[in-house]
Interface confidence: low
């Protein structure tokens, strides 16, 4: 039976999924804060242009009995069950905020492409990408590899000046979601980092990591890896680093690099950090006080969601057109709108573009220092330490194959 | 590739049934009726998601006709009671090969060849 929509005559539903399988171990309670939050901004917002309506989230809980890992390997499924609990409710809001696993959304997509933008805090993975009426707001896999594309490549800066085509990838697959599907988005061989890599080994073993380390007959000085810094540490210890290794460490939602007291441990000096440059306000607000950086990012996206609705909202209602049309569905992407702490910028299929910001630990002070920013909304990158105090030599990345010369 | 037959359909006097089935080789996304009446382009009718959660109809048909689908049987139906004589039409069923929104018959990739339904009055 069709599934009627609460979403019209001055009263506006969001159906907000409080998933048991979560991308990360964030409470529900804490979720529901981040939407009870933006729902006030977005009434606040309605009431200052001068609309009179009604905006309210339901949250649709799972019964957990079933799909109780916690984590995304049953998620497809509760998703689905969550879906049934709506159709057979006969309630859908205007929107659906929720699905973070890429499983779930994916599945989920198949399940909503007729009728209702699907909003997610999460959904990394490549078979996310290019879905017309799915937004997210957390960065996914594709901008990424992109990233790591332009950084290879480049070879016109005083500290890179080789540029790239090789790379060992750590996966042993205990990583949190974003980490599995950034490393998986890097590993598929169909990939756009695999086709522009001359050539690219995907190491699963602890020991296999620790042998490179000092492998003469290394193919590649470079390894990503994805985590945080203890991470690194349990895998490398204080084992001794080849000069000319680079490791590159994705760690994208966490701003502890950027608190002022923060000194870098020594087994950090072969390494580049990327990760997000913080919010503007996010660091000091009353909403994040309780939470940890990558929740803050999580529940953060939650929030935005709920803003983002309200930002279409507001335009659909003042200029006097439908919201149960395919053209709100699709209307999620490719704009600005004001986010909790600051403006958010979607690309073309709604994903989220941001600022990545790639970190190195300054021998002098010991202190995590911004080497450059990249801007995944036009894929450039922008230098900002012209003169890193690097470990390596002659303050300079190294080239990524041992031997060969200047390119 | 994807190969699409209905069956079911007929000649019916104004006021009665028809079940229009549609069998599929492959059944994974979303999948859909259309129909064209002589002289007239071809109209969505009705459409029902890859999973079978969701459904959505136009409004000409919304009460009378009811989609459903059987992923275990590769297999779509459409329920049609109530019928007018403006239902007249050649039925076609469509299935979609990768998850893409929108109800035009240019967001459906793959198209059976038709079943008569006659509606006398």
């Known amino acids: 039976s069709q599934v009627s929509q609460n979403c019209h005559n001055g009263s506006y539903e969001i159906s907000v999924l409080m998933m048991g399988n979560s991308a990360f171990a964030e409470p529900l309670k804490n979720l529901e804060d981040a939407v009870n939050e933006g729902l006030e901004i977005v009434r606040g917002r309605l009431q200052n242009a001068g609309l009179n309506v009604t905006v309210n989230a339901t949250f649709m809980y799972s019964d957990g009995l079933i799909h109780n890992s916690g984590d995304c390997r049953s998620s497809t499924c509760e998703g689905l069950d969550l879906l049934r609990k709506i159709s057979n409710a006969q309630r859908m809001g205007c929107v659906l905020i929720g699905p973070s696993c890429t499983y779930s959304t994916f599945q989920m997509y198949l399940d909503t492409e007729l009728s209702y933008p699907m909003i997610s805090a999460g959904s990394f993975g490549l078979s996310c990408d290019y879905k017309e009426t799915l937004t997210r707001l957390m960065s996914p896999a594709r901008k990424l590899m992109y990233f790591l594309v332009n950084f290879w490549k480049t070879n016109d800066l005083p500290f890179k000046t080789y540029s790239w085509s090789t790379s060992y990838v750590y996966k042993n697959g205990t990583e949190t979601e974003d980490c599995f599907w950034y490393l998986n988005a890097l590993e598929a061989s169909v990939s756009y980092f695999s086709h522009e890599l001359g050539f690219k080994v995907v190491l699963r073993q602890d020991k296999e990591f620790q042998d490179i380390l000092m492998d003469h007959n290394r193919k590649s000085n470079v390894i990503i890896m994805c985590g945080g810094p203890e991470f690194l540490y349990k895998l490398k210890g204080d084992r001794a680093v080849a000069e000319d290794i680079v490791i590159i460490l994705v760690d994208l939602f966490n701003d502890q690099y950027f608190e002022d007291n923060v000194t870098a441990p020594d087994y950090m000096k072969n390494v580049l950090v990327l990760t997000l440059s913080p919010g503007n306000s996010l660091l000091n607000s009353s909403f994040s006080r309780n939470l940890s950086p990558t929740k803050r990012d999580f529940a953060l996206a939650y929030l935005n969601g709920i803003l983002l609705f309200g930002h279409m909202l507001k335009i659909f209602l003042e200029n006097g057109e439908n919201i149960t049309t395919p053209k709100f569905a699709h209307a999620f992407r490719n704009l600005t709108f004001e986010g909790y702490d600051g403006p958010v910028t979607l690309d073309d299929w709604g994903d989220v573009d941001s600022t990545m910001v790639l970190l190195y630990t300054s021998v002098d002070t010991k202190k995590y220092k911004v080497l450059l920013t990249y801007d995944t909304h036009v894929n450039k990158t922008y230098p900002v330490d012209m003169s890193p105090t690097f470990t390596w030599k002659n303050s300079k990345l190294p080239n990524d194959i041992t031997g060969r010369g200047p390119q | 590739d994807v190969q699409l037959q209905e069956s079911g359909g007929g000649l019916v006097q104004a006021g009665g049934s028809l079940r229009l089935t549609c069998t599929t080789t492959f059944s994974s996304y979303a999948m859909g009726w259309f129909r064209q009446a002589p002289g007239k382009e071809r109209e969505f009718v009705a459409t029902?998601?890859?999973?079978?959660?969701?459904?959505y109809y136009a409004d000409s048909v919304k009460g009378r006709f009811t989609i459903s689908r059987d992923n275990s049987k590769n297999t779509m139906y459409l329920q049609m009671n109530s019928l007018k004589f403006e239902d007249t039409a050649v039925y076609y069923c469509a299935q979609r090969n990768i998850p893409r929104y929108g109800l035009e018959s240019r967001n459906y990739d793959y198209w059976g060849q038709g079943t008569q339904v006659t509606v006398s009055s």
């Open positions: 029902i998601s890859g999973g079978g959660v969701y459904t």
